[in-house]
Every structure is written in C-alpha cells, then in structure tokens.
C-alpha cells in the first residue's frame, strides 16, 4: 500500500548490525509523486566499491547509489548526510553485511517522503501535444482554441471527422482551407452514395498543398482515399500528384487526412460527384447484344442472344437468349452465363448398328451410323450421316432427327449351297447355306426365319404345339450342339384362318392354307449362321413356272436315317400340280379322291428321287429372286406329300404375303416400329 513517507533503519539500529545480513525495503508512494530519500546516519564498514558491507538504492533497473563508510552532515542546520531524489514512485533499498566486521558499526537511519514531480518539464518526452499543466501529484494537458483533447488525454486535434456526404455532388476541403490545416490531426470524411453510383473525385493540381514527404519518400502529412478494398494514395507535396479524376468504382469512399505536429500548409480542396456505375462492354463470344450501346451504366438491361448453334446452359435447360442487367456493383447479372456451342450429346445407339465415338458432340460435328454389315442394312436411307444441328439434335438430311434403322439383310447365305448328294436324295448342307433354317424339336420339323421377330412355318407343325421350342444357327441338332446354338422362345402362334382345325388331325386330307407365323419374344441377332429369307414380291415376276429350281433343307427323314442330325438339302424343280396328284398316297387315311389340291400349293420334285420328307415340314422352298440373283425368297413351305422320294407339296407363300404382312404389322412391338 503506497505511503507518503517512512523510516528505514538497519538491523539492530542504533546497535551494531549483525554479520551476514541481507535485507531489502520496497518503497512505494502514490502515482504522480516522486521519492525523496535521505540518510541522517551512516556508519557501515568501508571497503572498495562497498564490496563488504553496503546499502544499495535501486530505481527500476537503475542503481541510484551504493553507500558505505561514515558520513556526517555538511550543514549544521540539517541532519542529512546523503540524499536521493527520483521522479518515480517506486524505490528499493538493499542492505548487505559480510561475515566479519573488524570494528563495531552501527548501520544507518534513512527517511523517505513523497515529493511532487513536474511531468511537464522533468522528462525528455513531453507528455502533451500542446499545453502541459502540472499539479501536485499529476498533470493535465490542454489545447488551443478550436482544438479538442483526444481520448488519450494527451493529444490535441481539430474536430474534423464524422462528416458523411450523401449528395450526388459536393465539395470537401481540409480544415481552415486555404489557411494552414491543424497539426496533429486525423480527419475522416465519408461519402456514401446510393448503390449503383460510383464516386468520382476531381482535384486541381493548384488546390493541393500538403507537407512534403521525407527523404525516404514517406508522407509526413497525407491524404488517402479508400474505396472498399481499393486505396488511392497516400498523396502529399505541393500540387496534387495523383490523377485529377479518380473513378472509385464504388458508391462508398472514405477520405483520410492525417497530419503530424509540424509543417502546416494550406491543405486541399476537392469536388466529387456520383456517376451511374458503368458495366464493361464485355466480349461475349457467339452472341449479339440488344440494344448495342457504346457505354452501359447502372440499371441498363441487355438481351444477349446466342448465334445459331449456340445456347445458354443453365442447369439442365438450354435457352437461346438471356437478359443481363448492369448491377449496382458495376458487374453484369447472369455474367456466368455464356453462349456455348450446342451440345447434341452422345448420339443414341441403334439396334444392330453402331456410331463411331465422335471426336466432338458440339454444333457442326458430324457422325456416321453404320449397320452391322453384311447382316444388316440401313432401311430408311439417309446414308447414316448426321450433323449436330443448332437445335441440339443430330440431324440427317433425309430423315431429320429420326434415327436410322438397321434391318436384317434377307435371303443372302454366307456360303452358297453345293450339292454333294443325300432330306431324300439330297446332300449334306451347312447352316451357312441356309441361315434362315429353323429347327423345331417337337414335333421334329422346320421353319424359316423371315425377320428378327417372326418365323414362318407350316400350320400342321404348330397346330398341336402352340409353344414350340425352336433353334437357329446350328448345322447339327445334336443336343450338345443345340445347347450352343440360339434357342428361340415363342410369344404367340398365328395359324392362317383358312387352315381347318380337325378333331382328329391324323386323318387330314386337306392341307390348304398350311401356313403359320410364330411371333418371338425377343429379337434374333443376325450373323453368318442366322439370317432371314426374303418374302416373295407380289408382282408376276414371282409367279413360279414349271422347271424353276428351288432349294429345300431340313433335318427330316433320309434314305438312311429317320431323323437327320446334320442339315440336309436338295435342289428341286417346280412341277405341274397334276404330277403330285398322279402319285399314289402311300398311306391314305381316306379315298384318294378326298385329298385336296389347290392353287395355294406348289408341286415340286420328281427328279433323281429328291424330295422333302417327314421332319422337314415347315422349311422353306427357297427360290432365287428374279430381280436380285444374290438373294433367295421363300416361294414355298414344306407341307405334305403323297410319298417320300417322289413329289412334294409346298404352301405357295406368294398367296399369303398380304396375310403375313398384316399379321406382323398388327402384332409388332413399339421396339420394332
């Protein structure tokens, strides 16, 4: 607790002090006072530099004195033998004695009193910027007229801050302008305009005179403009050194004028006004601005329209134009939006065809669709070339945005059939000679693939089994081979409405309209061993003449086998219907006259004993297309016969083309359309 005065005595005083003592006293007087410490008695063993015994006076880190020996007063009117005056309010006194004393020393008596200090004069650093006033225990600062004392109670400045300018035009000057500005001041002026307007400051060189910079180039007095994160200045010197027109790009500007204690000049004067915030005329590629202007300012609205083939992509929606507004911050709204080339995207894949991965899917890019040749061809024309159009679609010159359709090539076997002799009297064949050949395992029979979804066969093959199991693509019908071939699953069987369904089909004598269609659940993939046969055209070119040759194939009875395991085939000529009528039916189920012969039947065979037989039913009688010799069409279907190895009767497919087309159309799937 600070005190105003006190007494300090060495141990045992006035008796002799003991050896080996170290004692300290911490003196503290109230703030604002100094300490006057004086000794009235001093009797301490003398030694060089008071090394043995001593009394030490310390102020902060400074040793004010170190005493030893004997002292007496020089002034008969004063008992003081030694004294110290410090301008601080704290002091430490330390007494030390060593291990022996040659004589008897009585030590010291000292007193301290709090004394006033003159803060205004006693220190090197003047505490007040202007006027300093001392009083007992302290001081205070004061200021000249029109100055005020800052919160630190030491510095004076002029009251030049706090002004906020909101008018769109105005003038600001330093205090007292054009008289000298006040020293030691910080003047802050704020300009706050409506958003969307930028502050533009204009100065004349002659309206600026501020204390010049020091030798290091640092302004002693300075004028600074701060607009957001941008700063202009500091400026100082005779004549304004900066740009005479400052576009701040901001609606808020802080003007800071800082002065020191020396060197006052006349100061400065400026004008400001608010400009609508300009927005840059940006170069937005592939677009047109409407309206077109040399300069755009706050609140201007433009419509930016993309050129053909370009679009604005926002989220998932594409648009051809957008509006942009010059905003209060000098930036265009929707500035992230750009006119990008229209992207037609990865082209859709097509069944049984392909499109090469395009290098680009952007506007103007070109892609080409191709079908899996030679098994498929492009049905709907157009050449397969598409370009990325301005509307974002892949477009073909002929088809527009419609995709090409790859449909199976019909009637073209991968390998031509060559007769090698053994069907009845026929030859071994490979499925590649007859890729349309379908195998039915129950009953053991045949059929002809006519497109991806449809199999043509004889009605008598499917009348007893409306869910036949069929196979394609295998020369051999040995079970292990069939497992590796393609099994076809029927969706529905369509028997010709003219086929008479009998209670006892075994007694049939009428095979008229012996034709049926099997709709498949899934499309068949074409290839070298699986590919359809063509249907006959409706023109007279497809009317068969006697002697025209056709090919039959199947796994039916041969001379040596009840059922062939490997495909057999034969080339037979068309014969007059009477030739079939003349052959005696081997096992008549009725009178020979009861057997029906109609124009819906083709008679063929009779040459070298070549004929179809049991197990070949439903297979195609394939004839070379008169208009395209590379192709075969199904002129007939193996139907019935009077006797194997003679003549056989085949359903005349040409008479059923309308029914076939109608049935297929009415029972197609969207996938196929």
């Amino acid at each position: 607790e600070p005190t105003m005065y006190g007494e300090i005595l060495s141990p045992n005083y006035p008796q002799a002090y003991p050896s080996e003592v170290e004692k300290s006293w911490d003196i503290e007087v109230p703030e604002g006072y100094g300490i006057h410490l004086y000794f009235t008695h001093l009797d301490i063993e003398l030694s060089e530099n008071c090394a043995y015994d001593s009394v030490q006076i310390i102020s902060g880190d400074t040793e004010e004195g170190r005493l030893c020996g004997q002292r007496s007063s020089n002034n008969p009117h004063s008992p003081i033998v030694e004294e110290f005056q410090v301008p601080y309010n704290k002091l430490q006194v330390i007494f030390k004695s060593d291990f022996s004393n040659e004589e008897r020393f009585t030590g010291f008596a000292a007193y301290y009193v709090a004394t006033d200090i003159n803060e205004c004069t006693d220190f090197v650093d003047v505490p007040c910027s202007h006027f300093c006033n001392n009083f007992i225990g302290g001081y205070f600062c004061s200021c000249p007229p029109e100055y005020f004392l800052h919160d630190d109670m030491k510095n004076c400045g002029v009251n030049c801050s706090g002004d906020v300018f909101t008018a769109l035009i105005g003038e600001i000057a330093s205090p007292n302008y054009p008289k000298p500005y006040p020293e030691n001041s910080r003047c802050e002026y704020q300009i706050r305009l409506e958003k969307g307007f930028q502050v533009v400051v204009t100065l004349r060189r002659e309206d600026f005179d501020v204390e010049a910079a020091d030798s290091a180039g640092n302004c002693l007095d300075s004028l600074v403009f701060v607009a957001g994160d941008r700063q202009f200045g500091p400026y100082c010197g005779h004549g304004f050194p900066g740009p005479l027109n400052i576009e701040t790009k901001s609606n808020a500007l802080d003007i800071i004028f800082q002065t020191d204690l020396t060197g006052q000049k006349k100061g400065w004067k400026l004008r400001y006004h608010g400009d609508p915030m300009p927005c840059p005329k940006e170069d937005t590629p592939n677009s047109v601005w409407e309206p077109a202007k040399a300069k755009y300012v706050f609140r201007d609205v433009v419509q930016i329209t993309c050129l053909d083939g370009f679009e604005v992509v926002e989220g998932r929606v594409g648009a051809t134009s957008f509006y942009s507004t010059c905003q209060s911050n000098g930036k265009w709204s929707n500035s992230k939006l750009k006119c990008q080339p229209v992207d037609c995207g990865i082209p859709e894949s097509i069944e049984n065809g392909k499109v090469e991965d395009p290098e680009s899917t952007l506007f103007g890019s070109v892609i080409r669709y191709t079908c899996e040749e030679p098994y498929y061809y492009m049905e709907n024309g157009g050449g397969g070339e598409y370009h990325c159009a301005g509307n974002g679609s892949w477009v073909n010159e002929v088809l527009g945005p419609e995709l090409p359709k790859c449909v199976p090539v019909c009637g073209v076997p991968r390998e031509p059939f060559e007769e090698k002799q053994r069907i009845i009297g026929g030859s071994d064949a490979d499925i590649k000679n007859f890729p349309w050949q379908v195998f039915f395992d129950n009953p053991w029979a045949g059929g002809a693939l006519i497109n991806e979804y449809w199999v043509l066969t004889a009605a008598h093959v499917v009348e007893g089994n409306r869910e036949p199991t069929m196979y394609v693509g295998s020369t051999s019908v040995q079970t292990s081979r069939l497992a590796k071939s393609k099994m076809l699953t029927p969706e529905h069987v369509f028997i010709h409405p003219g086929w008479k369904l009998l209670e006892v089909p075994e007694g049939r004598t009428n095979f008229d309209n012996d034709i049926a269609l099997v709709r498949l659940k899934d499309p068949v993939k074409m290839g070298p061993t699986v590919s359809p046969i063509c249907l006959p055209g409706t023109s007279s070119d497809y009317n068969l003449m006697d002697g025209d040759l056709g090919l039959i194939s199947g796994w039916g009875r041969t001379e040596k086998r009840d059922r062939a395991v490997r495909l057999k085939a034969a080339r037979l000529p068309v014969a007059p219907l009477r030739k079939c009528k003349e052959v005696k039916v081997e096992k008549p189920t009725a009178d020979a006259e009861a057997y029906v012969f109609t124009p819906n039947m083709i008679c063929a065979g009779g040459e070298k004993g070549m004929d179809s037989c049991k197990g070949d039913s439903g297979g195609a009688f394939a004839v070379q297309d008169p208009n395209d010799k590379t192709k075969f069409y199904a002129a007939g279907l193996v139907s019935w016969g009077p006797q194997c190895g003679t003549y056989g009767l085949y359903t005349r497919v040409k008479n059923y083309v309308d029914w076939i087309m109608k049935t297929m159309q009415e029972n197609s799937t969207p996938r196929e359309d």
Epitope: P443, A564, V565, E586, K587, K614, C644
Partner: antibody, heavy 119, light 111 residues
Framework: EVQLQQSGAELVRPGASVKLSCTAS????????IHWVKQRPEQGLEWIGR????????KYAPKFQDKATMTADTSSNTACLQLNSLTSEDTAVYYC????????????WGQGTLVSVSA | DIVLTQSTDYLAVSLGQRATISCKAS??????????MNWYQQKPGQPPKLLIY???NLESGIPARFSGSGSGTDFTLNIHPVEEEDAATYYC?????????FGGGTKLEIK
C-alpha cells in the same frame, strides 16, 4: 406329358398269333417313329424294328422279318405289333418306345407287355 | 449286324467308389461326326431308362454322377460315386445302322 400305354399280358398257345398295342398320349404318333423291343426272361434286349406311322414305312431286324408285323393307326394314335407262329422262344416282355425330341435313342418307353407261350 | 460286346456280365463295386462299364462295337458307330451309342439302366420289372445318348450326353433328370465317353468302337459308362440305388443292369445300344442292336448287359451290384 408323353406316355405310352401298352396292352395287358397275353397267354397264348404255340402256333397261334397275338396282337399287342401301344397307345400314345401327349403327342401325335404321326410326328414320331414307334420302335419295338423284345426281352426274354432273364435275358437282354433285342430290337425288333420300327414304323413311321405317317406312311407305314417300316424296318425290321432280319431275325424278326417273318415273325413280327408292325402297324399304326394315326386316327387312334395307336401302334400295334402282331406276332405269329408263336413258340416258347417268343415268351418275352415286348416294349414299345419312341424318339421324342431325340433322333436315335429312346427317352420314352411303354411299361411292357408279357407274352407267355404255353401249351 | 453290328455286335456290341459288354465284356463284364457282372460287376460288384463298393458304395461311393467308381463303376466303369465298357462296350465294344464290331464296327464304328460314328456318322457325320456323331457317335450313335446310347446307355440304358434297367431294374427288375421296369422298362429300360435312358441315361446317356450320343455317347456322352446326359439325359435330362439323370444325376451327374453318370457319364459316358468314347467314339468309333470303344465306349464307356462311368458311375461315380456309386449309390445303393444304382444296383441294376446296364445296356449299351447302337443306332447307327439297321438293325439296331443292344449289348448283352452288365449287372452292377453294390457292396
């Protein structure tokens, strides 16, 4: 379901004839071939022959050429085997069998008919 | 006629072991790359039952422990592991050439 139902056991005098039947269900015999197989008591199997019911085309093992006659009636879906001039050597179980969806084997057999030749 | 010889009339095999039954034809039963050899199992009082067709194809519904191999004139039926219910007589049969013929049969007993 494919089934072959054979006629019942026969006890016949030596020198007489007998006609065995095999009635099919679940398929048309016209679409298949009917085979006949003989098995003497405690003996192995012997192939008698086959018939194509569609045209009565037949094939016999030489041994049975004069002993057996195969016929088929597609209207009743039945095949028959007639054995003539019976002797004790003809005492056996006679089976009918078909191909089904096979091409040279018998996945389907009748239950067999026992023919006993005894004076 | 093609004669089929099953050299073993009688075969006794321990439960769980392998049974091998062979069949030799007097001439090849191959045609067009296929072997016309089939195997049947017969139990007393029952018709024969198809096990293997075309030398190596397992008839549907027959356990996989039955397998067939061979071509030309030499064929084998393997059963592994043998089970109690496999006690029966086994016949080979060729259908390559008329008349179709059967082997004499091999009777399998389970020890």
């Amino acid at each position: 379901e494919v089934q072959l139902q054979q006629s019942g056991a026969e006890l016949v005098r030596p020198g007489a004839s007998v006609k065995l039947s095999c009635t099919a269900s679940g398929f048309n015999i016209k679409d298949d071939y009917i085979h006949w197989v003989k098995q003497r008591p405690e003996q192995g199997l012997e192939w008698i022959g086959r018939i194509d019911p569609a045209d009565d085309h037949t094939k016999y093992a030489p041994k049975f050429q004069d002993k057996a006659t195969m016929t088929a009636d597609t209207s009743s879906n039945t095949a028959c085997l007639q054995l003539n001039s019976l002797t004790s050597e003809d005492t056996a179980v006679y089976y009918c069998a078909i191909y089904g969806s096979g091409w040279a084997w018998f996945p389907y057999w009748g239950q067999g008919t026992l023919v006993s030749v005894s004076a | 006629d093609i004669v089929l010889t099953q050299s073993t009339d009688y075969l006794a095999v321990s439960l769980g072991q392998r049974a091998t039954i062979s069949c030799k034809a007097s001439q090849s039963v191959d045609y067009d790359g296929d072997s016309y050899m089939n195997w049947y199992q017969q139990k007393p009082g029952q018709p024969p039952k198809l096990l293997i067709y075309a030398a190596s194809n397992l008839e549907s519904g027959i356990p996989a422990r039955f397998s067939g191999s061979g071509s030309g004139t030499d064929f084998t039926l393997n059963i592994h592991p043998v089970e109690e219910e496999d006690a029966a007589t086994y016949y080979c049969q060729q259908s390559n050439e008329d008349p179709w013929t059967f082997g004499g049969g091999t009777k399998l007993e389970i020890k």
